[in-house]
């Protein structure tokens, strides 16, 4: 075994190094001391370290470790934060375009239904945005709300434009009739299915990205235990006490220490792998009715078709509703 | 029949992009993200090794420090002796993860469960009763998945028609992307050291 080089007789080297860590403090002994009070850098002979120095080394070692961890996760963190923001903005843009497409469809095909239709369409897409951002809204309720609101306007403006203003109190009756008579056929149900499937997937995708950020942030800001601090100090700084300033830790030893310090963090590994693979599976399935871009940007067409369906059955509907809602003030329609 | 109501848009560049075949779509961006994430799949298991390789460790020196003394780099003492009479490493591992780590593991388990639930086989997923009285399936055929929209000539086939929106200064990986401040993007040389961490075992 090679003999250790003789320790610095004056601790001068150790002092000049320690001054860089803690300027102005007189904690370094002038000459090597027995060091019986040391708890981490247990000396085999005289040492240039004091108890105070040891404490400072421990603090520095833990800070170094935290910085190394943060630099390790920097690129991954940047990747997820950036994409979470980009996708959220992208989804908002899709919602805005879908609203514009739908409004344009009303303006071009059914100008008599605006501005009320614009209001209902606006409220519907506001609900869509809220849902994507995590609000607890029931998609079926959103779609029913849209068609419940639209039908009275369609009936009074398109199907029965001759109704006097006083007849506008039949709106409540028309809302009820809309569901019971399946006025729009199965279009509302089709929209419910498509919208709920695509928005559910979109929402969970965003939630997953945000959780990814939370995972990295959590491990990024871990505070390492005192035991870990001692092990790191022994590995990185105890050699200095013997005046061995240029010596580096052995690779295998470093791995053992790091595995000890990071035992808890490494437990995340299994779930992190599963997270990435599950996210990949989700993304692979985000097409057709599971792709909100497809579904929302095509909604104007389905809504248009649903109104055409009403118009096609207008004769039959007008007769039925005429009877049903003739006495809407007296009877309450469910 | 309804048509794409393009006349509504003032921002014509959005529409130009809307029909260019090879523009980046949201789905291609998603796939690209997954590919990048997969290079980090071993991030946590590789962390100890990464940190050792990024802190001072004896690589070419004959002698190295094992926590107690100077030893030859390839001797058994290089890994073992320094751990004797020290804090019990096994004990440190047995303590289990910090409460915050346990919490985040629980959250990961929960999201993984949700992701799996959402990723069920995507066969004929729409309710079969969509074809009942009152619904005309037009040219949708049996697979309702194919159709976004309702019936007949109002139908829009959505294959390839929805291109990503130029409104987003989108490819944030490009340093000179419009509206992308250069400080915000770590340069390649700053981050490449860690890029293959996922492949370290």
């Amino acid at each position: 075994q090679p003999p250790p080089p003789p320790p610095d007789a004056t601790c001068h080297q150790v002092r000049s190094f320690f001054q860089r860590l803690q300027p102005g403090l007189k904690w370094v002994p002038e000459t090597p001391v027995p060091g019986s009070d040391l708890q981490v850098c247990l000396p085999k002979g005289p040492t240039c370290c004091s108890r105070k120095m040891e404490e400072k080394y421990q603090l520095t070692a833990r800070l170094n470790m935290e910085q190394l961890l943060q630099s390790a996760s920097m690129e991954l963190k940047f990747l997820i934060i950036q994409n979470a923001a980009v996708f959220q903005e992208a989804f908002e843009i899709v919602v805005r375009h879908a609203k514009n497409y739908t409004n344009a469809m009303f303006k071009n095909n059914y100008p008599s239904l605006t501005p009320q239709a614009f209001e209902f369409v606006g409220e519907f897409f506001t609900d869509v945005s809220l849902y994507i951002l995590g609000s607890d809204i029931n998609v079926d309720d959103m779609v029913n709300e849209l068609f419940d609101s639209l039908f009275p306007v369609i009936y009074t403006q398109l199907m029965n434009p001759g109704l006097p203003d006083s007849a506008l109190d039949i709106n409540e009756c028309l809302r009820g009739a809309r569901r019971d008579l399946k006025v729009f056929g199965n279009f509302p149900k089709l929209i419910m299915t498509q919208v709920s499937k695509s928005l559910q997937v979109t929402r969970i995708f965003l939630q997953a990205l945000n959780l990814g950020i939370e995972v990295i942030n959590t491990t990024d800001h871990l505070k390492f235990s005192k035991d870990c601090g001692r092990m790191l100090t022994r590995m990185w700084y105890c050699s200095y006490c013997q005046g061995l300033m240029m010596v580096k830790p052995c690779g295998g030893y470093c791995n053992v220490v790091m595995q000890g310090c990071m035992a808890g963090v490494v437990e995340i590994d299994k779930y992190w792998r599963e997270y990435i693979l599950s996210l990949e599976e989700l993304v692979n399935g985000m097409y057709r009715i599971y792709d909100m871009e497809n579904v929302l940007l095509g909604l104007f067409s389905t809504i248009h078709d649903s109104i055409q369906y009403v118009q096609k059955n207008a004769g039959k509907l007008t007769t039925t509703i005429g009877k049903l809602c003739a006495h809407s003030q007296q009877r309450q329609y469910r | 029949s309804a048509y794409y109501p393009e006349d509504l848009f003032i921002d014509k560049k959005v529409l130009k992009v809307a029909h260019v075949e090879h523009e980046e779509t949201l789905s291609s961006r998603r796939r690209e993200l997954i590919q990048k994430l997969k290079s980090f799949i071993s991030f946590y298991s590789a962390l100890p090794g990464y940190i050792c390789s990024h802190s001072p460790v004896a690589e070419n020196d004959t002698l190295c420090w094992n926590g107690q003394e100077l030893v030859e780099r390839y001797s058994q003492k290089a890994a073992r002796n320094g751990m004797k009479n020290q804090f019990n490493l096994h004990e440190l591992k047995m303590k289990g993860p910090e409460p915050v780590v346990s919490q985040i593991i629980d959250k990961l388990k929960h999201i993984n469960q949700l992701l799996r639930t959402m990723s069920m086989p995507k066969g004929r997923v729409l309710d079969k009763n969509l074809d009942e009285e009152g619904f005309e399936s037009g040219d949708c055929g049996d697979d309702e998945d194919e159709c976004i929209g309702g019936s007949g000539d109002g139908m829009i086939k959505v294959k390839n028609q929805l291109r990503f929106l130029a409104e987003l200064a989108y490819d944030l990986d490009v340093d000179d992307a419009p509206g992308n401040s250069q400080q915000a993007t770590p340069k390649d040389n700053e981050i490449s050291t860690f890029h293959n961490l996922g492949n370290v075992h």
Partner: antibody
Framework: QVQLQESGGGLVQPGRSLRLSCAAS????????MHWVRQAPGKGLEWVSA????????YYADSVKGRFTISRDNSKNTLYLQMNSLRAEDTAVYYC??????????????WGQGTLVTVSS | QSALTQPPSASGSPGQSVTISCTGT?????????VSWYQQYPGKAPKLLIY???SRPSGVPDRFSGSKSGTSASLAITGLQAEDGADYYC??????????FGGGTKVTVLG
Amino acid sequence: QVQLQESGGGLVQPGRSLRLSCAASGFTFSSYAMHWVRQAPGKGLEWVSAISSSGGSTYYADSVKGRFTISRDNSKNTLYLQMNSLRAEDTAVYYCAKDRRGSHADAFDVWGQGTLVTVSS
Amino acid sequence: QSALTQPPSASGSPGQSVTISCTGTSSDVGLMHNVSWYQQYPGKAPKLLIYKSSSRPSGVPDRFSGSKSGTSASLAITGLQAEDGADYYCQSYDSSLRVVFGGGTKVTVLG
């Protein structure tokens, strides 16, 4: 005539339960979200709970979460509020209110006259 | 969830104008959420005056108007009348879709 009529209020001891009902008429009940709002004597309005048109989503104020349950029976045009583990601070006039929308809270365009709940030993 | 902030009182002479402010946060009024205003007389149920920040239900006089900017909303009453003496509440909802009310403002018509 659009109307909401609350019932079920009264004097109750702390820790006990009470169930409020609200009968709706004159509008398509199943098409609108519904709410309970309360007002303690001499105080302002405090929202208690809401339910969407289908009953698929429910919402609660922090002060009642876990103790109160909102529900609706669209076939009977009736809204309910089951109040358990009542406390003195739950003493108030409880109003039933109709939302102008179906999917979630927006604005309350029809209100009942209120029913007084007094929690005291 | 925290309440929206309103001044406790406001007053004016008949014919004058009164404005009541309502301040929220970025998670309620400041979001895309609408603000509503209610009028309440003592011992009576509240009545909707304004919804969607500036829309008036039929039957509400056009002396009442609402506006919203950022995280604040306001109700203006022009040409104050004796019957306008009442309590006024603003209301919105937060990102969890839970409703928030303001603390209420007592409007007094002087003289």
